[in-house]
Structure formats: C-alpha cells, structure tokens
C-alpha cells in the first residue's frame, strides 16, 4: 500500500555486517511506526527482526536481536549483524503505520544481501 524504497543489492562486510536504508512515503501523520525485516527464500518468508518506535525517538530492537537501527523522519537505517554465507538472500523491509488510524502497510521490493565468509587465515611458521 505505502511506497517503501530500499536498495536492490548490499554486500555484507567481512565481519558479517550489512546495512541499508529503508525509506517510506507516509500518507498521514503517524506517531507509532513498526519496521520489520523479512527474509524471503523461494515461497518461504521468515521474520528476521522487528521494532516499533515513536516518531522522533530511537528505534529499539529486542536485546537478542541481530538487528540495530536508527530512524530519521521517514527513513530507517537498518543494520543486520552476524551474517554468514548461508544467510545470503532477499531481505524485505516492511513498514506499518500503527497509530493513529488509519493503518497503512508498505512492503519494499527487497534488498539482496550477499555474504561471503572470510577465508581462514593460513597457518604461519613465524
């Protein structure tokens, strides 16, 4: 419903960290926003992390979440940590304007995150 923009491709760092911006076009004056990161593989969709925040306040994920983020206006800067090669896939940003009514929901087209496991260091004779 809402327009949600996110980059098409992101390469994770060698430490398994990937960051991208999720931007939404708000039709109204939402004060409470929920952002969810979904991972889609074939026809399976799994929730990676989610956070609800009040406009003007910081984005707070659960303590054990692999995600962190900051918000600024209608932009959310998302960071996913602890990624490994097997986590390579399409990560979709879902934004919901929770309060006040009306409820709006928007789905981004997804960001393909590529994760390359670092090569193990060769044994050294020094």
């Amino acid at each position: 419903a809402m327009h949600v923009a996110q980059p098409a491709v992101v390469l994770a760092s060698s430490r398994g960290i990937a960051s991208f911006v999720c931007e939404y076009a708000s039709p109204g004056k939402a004060t409470e926003v929920r952002v969810t990161v979904l991972r889609q593989a074939d026809s399976q969709v799994t929730e990676v992390c989610a956070a609800t925040y009040m406009m003007g306040n910081e984005l707070t994920f659960l303590d054990d979440s692999i995600c962190t983020g900051t918000s600024s206006g209608n932009q959310v800067n998302l960071t996913i940590q602890g990624l490994r090669a097997m986590d390579t896939g399409l990560y979709i940003c879902k934004v919901e304007l929770m309060y006040p009514p009306p409820y709006y929901l928007g789905i981004g087209n997804g960001t393909q995150i590529y994760v390359i496991d670092p090569e193990p260091c060769p044994d050294s004779d020094f």
């Epitope: 419903a1 039709p27 789905i107």
Partner: antibody
Amino acid sequence: EVQLVESGGGLVQPGRSLRLSCTASGFTFSDNWMNWVRQAPGKGLEWVAQIRNKPYNYETYYSDSVKGRFTISRDDSKSIAYLQMNSLKTEDTAVYYCTGGMDYWGQGTTVTVSS
Amino acid sequence: DIQMTQSPSSLSASVGDRVTITCGASEIIYGALNWYQQKPGKVPKLLIYGATNLADGVPSRFSGSGSGTDFTLTISSLQPEDVATYYCQKILSPPPWTFGGGTKVEIK
C-alpha cells in the same frame, strides 16, 4: 466521533448514471485513502475503487468489473469522496459503502439498477 | 491479480468452542491482510489489521495469525454475539484489495 455518510443511491435504469457522495467527519480526511466497497444482495463484499491522498498524488485504482465506467474522486476541502457511476448494469445493484482507510465504514447507500 | 480463498464457507459451533477460519492468498502477501466481521443487517467492522493486530474495541478472544500466504482468524471461545459473516481482505499494493468469499458462523 467518526462518521461517514453516503448519499446519492436510488433506483436507476441500465445504461444511466448516478453519483454517490461520502461526507466524512471526526477524523483527518486528508490523511486517508478513501475506498468504495459494495455488497450485492445476499453476496459477499467486493472492493470497487480507491483514491489515495495528496502525498500519493491522488492516485486512483479500480476493480476490473467497474474500470472505465466508474470514477472515484475527492474534495479534501469539504471532506467528501465521490463515486461517479456511468453505464450502469443490473449487476451493479448493491449496497455501496464508503471507507476511510479500511478502518472507518459508512452505513451504506443502496443502488438498484433495473428497467 | 492475487486471489483470496476463505474456508470453510460456513460453520456451526457451540458456545465456548474454539473456532478457526482460514484465508489463503494465491501469492505471498507479507501479512498485508485484514479481517472483518459483518453481523446480519449491519455494516462490516474491522477486527484484525496487518494479519495479527487487534482493532480497537475488539474482544481479546479474537486473534489473527499467519504470514506469507496462509492466515487464520481464531475465536478462542465462541459467544452468541459472534454470529456473523467473517471476511479476509488483501491490502497489499497494487489494488485490487480483494476480499475472501466470507465464512458464515452460526451457533449450534
């Protein structure tokens, strides 16, 4: 208190036109995407049309069954949404509901298309 | 267009029973789904939005679950006032915002 009041329904012959109005109060009309949903006698709900708001350039969308015949519009200064229905068919007979987002619903207005 | 398939089309259950209604989408809709209740002769009322969120004033015996393509509306303990027809609706852009065919719930 949120109110949506539909008007303009009635009995009309096939091929003729009718314009429905939806007057809103009790909420910020300009923040809402407005929809029309209809329900034929004894049948289920059918989404008909949607008009978005200014941040979305007042984009409009229609169900295939009414595309080219119905036109949705809005006047934010008056908090009114409209549904202009042309070339009416007997299968357009239904109760027409106006909705704000999908959160708020009006009481509906009955449109009967019959010769 | 994405099709929404609701089942069953009708059911009869006793007061206090747990009632489950399912709604399937022909494509992934990421939780972009609402549930409505329409009592006989009345206007439809929003029950659940975004697949899982309870609308204001809706009793806690109603709950929604699901993601992807398969969704469920559950009434944990059916009450006489729950006699109604229940509809799911896809709210993912682009429209059409298709409704399911409806499930009529009656008391045994």
